[in-house]
């Protein structure tokens, strides 16, 4: 299973649920569905209040039980480490895959943290992070921001990912804007 890691803003906007949580238990495999579930302890929710309604406490995260079908395998054994988890809701359950954005909270830049807590949501409705994977690539719309991190640095952990968000400048126009300057 291979996928291009998304820009964190794309992960935020395309997810039903974005939370901060600790992985606290040994994964269990369901003998019927062949999905495994990880027990988590949610510490913060950044997106999904409306989708969840009253059931605002997520206790488990679900993923296919094998790597070849995009299952997520949690390698950290540190049960006190917090992770940012961006996933999809299916039948009221939080699902993630290899392609989901799951990262240690401490590994995120201050700008990314600001993005998840406040700023990425501003760009969700109108703006699109457009990956540039090979030259030439050009903007297809004024609401697109060209994401060149992978092209220039061979990594999704480049400058645009760590420090910028694609936000509305004016109606019909989105541009890369620094998240640094917005950090209190």
């Amino acid at each position: 299973c291979t996928c291009v890691p998304p820009h964190p803003q794309t992960a935020f906007c395309n997810s039903d649920l974005v939370i901060r949580a600790k992985f606290v238990g040994t994964p269990e495999v369901n003998q019927t569905t062949l999905y495994q579930r990880y027990e988590i302890k949610m510490t913060k929710m950044y997106k999904g209040f409306q989708a969840l309604g009253d059931a605002a406490d997520i206790r488990f995260v679900y993923t296919p039980a094998m790597e070849s079908v995009c299952g997520y395998f949690h390698r950290s054994h540190n049960r006190s480490e917090e992770f940012l988890i961006a996933g999809k809701l299916q039948d009221g359950l939080l699902h993630i895959t290899t392609c989901s954005f799951v990262a240690p909270w401490n590994s995120l830049s201050l700008a990314q943290r600001r993005g998840f807590t406040k700023t990425y949501t501003v760009g969700c409705e109108e703006c699109t992070v457009f990956p540039c994977l090979s030259i030439p690539c050009k903007l297809q719309s004024g609401t697109h921001c060209l994401w060149t991190d992978q092209l220039l640095q061979g990594s999704e952990k480049g400058f645009q990912s760590r420090h910028l968000a694609c936000l509305p400048r004016e109606p019909g126009l989105c541009t890369w804007q620094s998240l640094r300057s917005q950090i209190a």
Partner: antibody
Framework: QVQLVESGGGLVQPGGSLRLSCAAS????????MSWVRQAPGKGLEWVSG????????FYADSVKGRFTISRDNSKNTLYLQMNSLRAEDTAVYYC???????WGQGTLVTVSS | DIALTQPASVSGSPGQSITISCTGT?????????VSWYQQHPGKAPKLMIY???NRPSGVSNRFSGSKSGNTASLTISGLQAEDEADYYC??????????FGGGTKLTVLG
């Protein structure tokens, strides 16, 4: 009680095909994932393929990927393994197993030889 | 392609205790509590003796016990009896390969 009965084994030439069946009884078939496991003569056990209860998730060992196809018919309580492009190294007793392998059948012998 | 490492053979006298080890990685034995042990007599299908690391199916003697520490699981048979002579296989759930087995251990009951 739980029962798994394999059938369909036999002698087949290299490059040939065979379809194994596993008839299940004594439990709610659709509530369990199922697997095929094989054992070559005098050798150890090797997991071959697995399928979820609803047939949505399907897994294969690298050694059979692209040649074998696992499927199930929950209305007939039956698990299948379609084996194509058979090789001499596929010779083994094939077992079907329930869930995370708590119950096994008695096995069916597949011999690939010219 | 054996995924889990077991000793090829172990032996013991009637009444003794023996332990068979099964070593894997953090993506199989170490990462999940899904280790099983099977007993196989010649020409027979494998029989489940231990599941989920340390649980015994009904009908299996309490002389059989299982445990796990890190990436290594163990099967202990106490009060060894002649009928325990067989091949023993460990098996674990594995995230990369779904289900993996050890190469098998031949248990010989001496005398």
């Amino acid at each position: 009680q739980v029962q798994l009965v394999e059938s369909g084994g036999g002698l087949v030439q290299p490059g040939g095909s065979l379809r194994l069946s596993c008839a299940a009884s004594g439990f709610t078939f659709s509530s369990y994932a199922m697997s095929w496991v094989r054992q070559a003569p005098g050798k150890g056990l090797e997991w071959v393929s697995g399928i979820s209860g609803n047939g949505v998730l399907i897994f294969y060992a690298d050694s059979v990927k692209g040649r074998f196809t696992i499927s199930r018919d929950n209305s007939k309580n039956t698990l299948y393994l379609q084996m194509n492009s058979l090789r001499a190294e596929d010779t083994a007793v094939y077992y079907c197993a329930r869930g995370l392998m708590d119950y096994w059948g008695q096995g069916t012998l597949v011999t690939v030889s010219s | 392609d054996i995924a889990l490492t077991q000793p090829a053979s172990v032996s013991g006298s009637p009444g003794q205790s023996i332990t068979i080890s099964c070593t894997g990685t953090s993506s199989d034995v170490g990462g999940y509590n899904y280790v099983s042990w099977y007993q196989q007599h010649p020409g027979k299908a494998p029989k489940l003796m231990i599941y989920d690391v340390s649980n015994r199916p009904s009908g299996v003697s309490n002389r059989f016990s299982g445990s796990k520490s890190g990436n290594t699981a163990s099967l202990t048979i106490s009060g060894l009896q002649a009928e325990d002579e067989a091949d023993y296989y460990c098996q674990s759930y594995d995230f990369v390969r779904f289900m993996v087995f050890g190469g098998g251990t031949k248990l010989t009951v001496l005398g």
